[in-house]
């Protein structure tokens, strides 16, 4: 490389910088126990100290545990990453009625709208279902659910939720209108509102009823009705929502009466290979820093230069691309991108180069 | 001192195989990602593999992928590249490196260079 020449030799010398020849640049090398936050890092604030598995670190530079998504009413929204916390919100079919720092202090049953009333707007992790009077007076062959109803005017009530104590958040029986939690639960499913960000503000309700069949009285509803696990698509066909039982997937979204449920990868893993709604090959997340430094000669006792963290405890890696890497194509899930395919130790299909930060954050 | 040093190249036939090999002594503090770049005459340098040490995991570039293998012997202290089904556009000086896993990320430092072996892949 003698046109690297000049360049390199910036470098020697001087013990807390290096030259690297695939960025061709003097780089700043990070003392002991602080790890780069670049692939070249410049200046001692692109090294930072590597927290514990399950802590992030803080804006305030300093080790803090990332909350927990244990309860039984949240579920992981995002993971717990080198630099940020874990995100939890309420799990789907209940929303968020008492907020906390990353996570919700109090999850209550999304309301089912009560008789003569229709789902205006969905519920969602944040949002509670929000209901309109029903349209009296509808033609039972509806051609469209616009035709469907008329707009309502004054106020639009809700159904009172019903809470989810942390304390009792498994199926006990909590009175609700005369039934139980598990009888509400049902009745949610029956109202079918999706925690999907894509149907909120969208008008939307009951599933309704079969065009076949006349439309009850007071009814403003009467699009056709799919079978349960489907969905009324754009084309108005009912399509089958996609399945979540592999072991690598959790529900990210539910079957409604106009979306597809949605899959996603379960903690600790991410997308490799995305699928309409789901993820059609979820690896386990990579490791982006290690933990314990051993020296070279130690390796004999030790499988690793490295002791790693445990899987899923570095979850955000977004990296630079090296020169001639083509870094993985990006996914609906969380996605990961890496170099070029993995070996069968980490397989990762890829796809056109990506423009991405420096910074790994 | 800390040294990498390849060895393993020299003249093959297209289809054939090779095995490079990168000896590191010395204290690589703190490494934990070592890899292969390669430099073929008159070009730039152009990354092959790498292997995170701590995990395992082993990443290709797409040129590479299902020809080249990378590994490890720590009790060695060795990294290796075994190269199958070779073409003429292998043809490189390859370098070794070894750095660190950038937080949050799965790109590393190269903060470690070797000086090279050529690896000629003619008829």
């Known amino acids: 490389f003698p046109q690297d020449r000049p360049f390199e030799d910036t470098c020697h010398g001087n013990p807390s910088h290096y030259y690297d020849k695939a960025v061709r640049r003097c780089c700043y090398r990070c003392p002991m126990g602080l790890f780069p936050t670049q692939q070249c890092p410049q200046r001692p604030t692109d090294c930072r100290k590597q927290c514990e598995p399950d802590y992030y670190l803080d804006e305030a530079d300093r080790c803090t545990a990332c909350v927990t998504c244990s309860r039984d009413d949240l579920v992981e929204k995002t993971p717990c990453a080198w630099n940020s916390s874990r995100v939890c919100e309420c799990r789907p079919g209940m929303f968020c009625s008492t907020s906390a720092v990353n996570s919700c202090a109090r999850c209550f049953f999304h309301s089912v709208c009560p008789a003569g009333m229709i789902v205006k707007f969905p519920g969602t992790a944040q949002k509670n279902t929000v209901c309109e009077p029903a349209s009296p007076g509808v033609s039972p062959a509806c051609a469209s659910p616009e035709n469907c109803k008329e707009p309502s005017s004054g106020t639009i009530p809700q159904a009172k939720p019903t809470p989810v104590s942390p304390a009792t958040s498994s199926a006990s029986t909590m009175p609700v209108r005369g039934g139980t939690r598990l009888a509400q639960e049902a009745a949610s499913k029956l109202t079918r509102a999706p925690d999907s960000p894509s149907s909120v503000g969208r008008p939307s309700s009951d599933p309704g009823l079969s065009p076949t069949q006349p439309c009850p009285e007071g009814s403003g509803d009467c699009r056709k009705q799919c079978e349960p696990d489907y969905y009324l698509d754009e084309a108005g066909r009912c399509t089958a929502c996609v399945s979540c039982s592999r072991d690598d997937l959790v529900e990210k979204t539910p079957c409604a009466w106009n979306s597809s449920r949605t899959c996603e990868c379960r903690p600790g893993m991410i997308c490799a290979t995305s699928a309409t709604n789901s993820c059609a090959r979820c690896v386990p997340y990579p490791i982006c820093a290690a933990e314990t430094v051993t020296k070279p000669q130690d390796m004999a006792e030790k499988d690793t230069t490295f002791e790693a963290p445990p899987l899923g405890t570095q979850p955000d890696c977004n990296p630079t691309p090296e020169n001639g890497e083509a870094p993985a194509s990006t996914s609906p899930t969380q996605s990961l991108l890496v170099d070029s395919q993995a070996s069968k130790t980490l397989p990762i299909p890829t796809s056109a180069p990506v423009a991405l930060s420096s910074t790994g954050k | 001192e800390v040294q990498l040093v390849e060895s393993g190249g020299g003249l093959v036939q297209p289809g054939g195989s090779l095995r490079l090999s990168c000896a590191a002594s010395g204290y690589i503090y703190s490494s934990n990602c070592m890899g292969w770049f390669r430099q073929a005459p008159g070009k730039g340098l152009e990354w092959v593999s790498r292997?995170?040490?701590?995990?395992?995991?082993?990443y290709y570039a797409d040129s590479v992928k299902g020809r080249f293998t990378i590994s490890r012997d720590n009790s060695k202290n060795t990294l290796y590249l075994q190269m199958n089904s070779l073409r003429a556009e292998d043809t490189a000086v390859y370098y070794c490196?070894?750095?660190?896993?950038?937080?949050?990320?799965?790109?590393?430092?190269?903060?470690?260079w070797g000086q090279g072996t050529l690896v000629t892949v003619s008829s």
């Open positions: 490196a070894a750095g660190r896993v950038v937080l949050g990320a799965v790109v590393c430092t190269n903060e470690y």
């Open positions: 292997i995170h040490t701590g995990s395992g995991s082993t």
